[in-house]
Amino acid sequence: RPSFSLVEDTTLEPEEPPTKYQISQPEVYVAAPGESLEVRCLLKDAAVISWTKDGVHLGPNNRTVLIGEYLQIKGATPRDSGLYACTASRTVDSETWYFMVNVTDAISSGDDEDDTDGAEDFVSENSNNKRAPYWTNTEKMEKRLHAVPAANTVKFRCPAGGNPMPTMRWLKNGKEFKQEHRIGGYKVRNQHWSLIMESVVPSDKGNYTCVVENEYGSINHTYHLDVVERSPHRPILQAGLPANASTVVGGDVEFVCKVYSDAQPHIQWIKHVEKNGSKYGPDGLPYLKVLKAAGVNTTDKEIEVLYIRNVTFEDAGEYTCLAGNSIGISFHSAWLTVLPAPGREKEITASPDYLEI
């Protein structure tokens, strides 16, 4: 019956990890909905065999028959699809054989490489395996405190599993959280076990608890939301940065600028230059040259540092970190002093053309 092989999803483990693992890819047994399926456990000397589906113990019921080394599924449904395993327990060790069951109308004919990232939150579980709710992705729940600027969107996640499929409800400060409790309501995505609130306001501050439950149990997780009110101000630059620096000719130097801004800042590094021997134009404004600005190949983190490699005397002078947002502009300056390299003559290089900005 096997029709094709599929890459084994190593994120699924049987309840008791075996001491020997199947090296080949698991075989795939394909059935159409309503069909019956019989699979033989391909393990030698299998005295005691236990079965699992998607890592959960599989027991007999009115549709699933377990006789010796055979598994029979009567009247298959798409929910019977999954990764199955039979484990032979012996006195010395145990061995597990994996296989896939695919109950679908359309018969597949190749590896499904797009479907093996194991990232899916929502899992269809076999209706035979009763299980209390459990968290499926605790990584997504680690950040309990969310400090979010006003008007932003916030998302809380509680990815869970269980059988029957658990329901999820949300509490705010320990009480039922209703749509009418906030202007604009909120969005719940059960498929991804998440709550979304758009355009948060100070009144949204509080504790948000997801309660995930089925008839076999209940679990919950609490997040704290703090809404930071935006204070309209121009960018704030960290005091003392950039700092004055000195280096010898041929050396390297870096200037650092730390920018804090609620509104999206635009950051530039500028050098004060001379034109015709003068630092200022006829209008009294300084001649400036933009050295680095956020753009195609720079992230905010990269723009915060200005590197000058293989320094020449001409690099000496005043450097300015300028940050602007919709409210205003802030800038800090620092000086670069270039010292002659030991035993080298002073370099003289021609000045490039500069634009008045």
Partner: antibody, heavy 117, light 107 residues
Framework: QVQLVQSGAEVKKPGSSVKVSCKAS????????ISWVRQAPGQGLEWMGY????????HYAQKFQGRVTITADESTSTAYMELSSLRSEDTAVYYC??????????WGQGTLVTVSS | DIQMTQSPSSLSASVGDRVTITCRAS??????LAWYQQKPGKAPKLLIY???ILQSGVPSRFSGSGSGTDFTLTISSLQPEDFATYYC?????????FGQGTKVEIK
């Protein structure tokens, strides 16, 4: 191989409606949400809405609210997107896309809808 | 809705070049960002999800980085088949939004 196969190109008059289908094969249809994304000629991608067949959830982009209806038929593993009150600026390629977790991992081949009088 | 600003809108590069495309979100989106490649007349293809995880079958010359509001897609050594349009997608808010796209052309 999981595949999403969409219905063929359509030419529609302004003011009319269009219904595009998206049939899934080779996977468990109800375990995933299906989104619809459109792309006007020479333009970028624009998300329209999604349906989660198993959970019975739909959500639409604000821009299309009231004009778009997304449905699914689990028995045929098919999702549908109906857009009403068509205008010339709705001329676009319409894609269905399967959500794996929350991003779109598998896309249909696209359906060109031309709105012209 | 969360706005995604992608830059540059187009760039010209040669085979073997290192190419960087950036995407900036109007607010923090954690790491809920994916990158897609689209060739003319074809559907988009998933390259990277969760900011930096390479989709199965995608060459390792593609990489993603960033968090919060600033994200980068890097192609370490551009190949002839990489000339295409690239889009970022935020899926933090379920009103999904794409960047405007970056067209990578042959210099």
């Amino acid at each position: 191989q999981v595949q999403l196969v969409q219905s063929g190109a359509e030419v529609k008059k302004p003011g009319s409606s269009v219904k595009v289908s998206c049939k899934a094969s080779g996977g468990t249809f109800s375990s995933y949400a299906i989104s619809w994304v459109r792309q006007a000629p020479g333009q970028g991608l624009e998300w329209m809405g999604y349906i989660s067949p198993y959970m019975g959830e739909t959500h639409y982009a604000q821009k299309f609210q009231g004009r778009v209806t997304i449905t699914a038929d689990e028995s045929t593993s098919t999702a549908y997107m109906e857009l009403s009150s068509l205008r010339s600026e709705d001329t676009a390629v319409y894609y269905c896309a399967r959500e794996s977790y929350e991003y779109f991992d598998i896309w249909g081949q696209g359906t060109l809808v031309t709105v012209s009088s | 809705d969360i706005q995604m600003t992608q830059s540059p809108s187009s760039l010209s590069a040669s085979v073997g070049d290192r190419v960087t495309i950036t995407c900036r979100a109007s607010q923090s989106i954690s790491n809920d960002l994916a990158w897609y490649q689209q060739k003319p007349g074809k559907a988009p293809k998933l390259l990277i999800y969760a900011t930096s995880i390479l989709q199965s079958g995608v060459p390792s010359r593609f990489s993603g980085s960033g968090s919060g509001t600033d994200f980068t897609l890097t192609i370490s050594s551009l190949q002839p088949e990489d000339f295409a349009t690239y889009y970022c997608l935020q899926y933090y808010d379920y009103s999904y939004t794409f960047g405007q796209g970056t067209k990578v052309e042959i210099k």
